[in-house]
Amino acid sequence: MNGRVDYLVTEEEINLTRGPSGLGFNIVGGTDQQYVSNDSGIYVSRIKENGAAALDGRLQEGDKILSVNGQDLKNLLHQDAVDLFRNAGYAVSLRVQHRLQVQNGPIGHRGEGDPSG
């Protein structure tokens, strides 16, 4: 019997200061570039080593970015989302959704990764 995969979803406000080489990450997604099935949201696909996001440490690959400086990223074309980040100024506030995978064992059994054993 296989374990069930669940996800723990949390939201966080991350304030980044643009560094000498920018914010230091890549994105995928948009209404014209659906990276996740049935979801046109914007996702972090890469965090650049020693970039502003990496040095801050909170933004992770796979995070969904919900808004930039209070502006919702829903229903945006991919390039429009890119441009929004590029024009976001020196201090950039990101509302992000982290999705942590949680592996559960079969019912009645403790999962391998369960720390309470």
Partner: nanobody, 125 residues
Framework: HVQLVESGGGSVQAGGSLRLSCTAS????????MAWFRQAPGKEREFVAA??????YYADSVTGRFTISRDNAKNTVYLQMNSLKPEDTAVYYC?????????????????????WGQGTQVTVS
């Protein structure tokens, strides 16, 4: 992990043409930013051209002579090189990164790319 395989290099006379190909593994190829770099003996690796979701970018030295294009159905990016010059002689490398950088004008930086091919030699005499 993304694997890149280049082909199409060779020797050509000045003024001639070559077309390089780079085929990538991965099911989300259309989201990759793809680029070509080159390295001549004793020189730094140099940006040639890149293509992202939003368009193509070129080094000044190749603008008007080289054209980068992609076929997402074939997971392949091409570099059409026309009016070749002896100074174009180098090993040409294909590079890839998933997604688009949110930082302006970073497309020509080798540090922006996570995956690299083995390279293909181009010699112009």
């Amino acid at each position: 992990h993304v694997q890149l395989v280049e082909s199409g290099g060779g020797s050509v006379q000045a003024g001639g043409s070559l077309r390089l190909s780079c085929t990538a593994s991965g099911r989300t190829f259309s989201t990759y930013t793809m680029a070509w770099f080159r390295q001549a003996p004793g020189k730094e690796r140099e940006f040639v051209a890149a293509i992202s979701w939003s368009g193509a970018y070129y080094a000044d030295s190749v603008t008007g002579r080289f054209t980068i294009s992609r076929d997402n159905a074939k997971n392949t990016v091409y570099l059409q090189m026309n009016s070749l010059k002896p100074e174009d002689t180098a090993v040409y490398y294909c590079a890839a990164v998933i997604g688009s950088t949110v930082d302006s004008y970073r497309t020509g930086d080798p540090l922006e790319y996570d995956y690299w091919g083995q390279g293909t030699q181009v010699t112009v005499s």
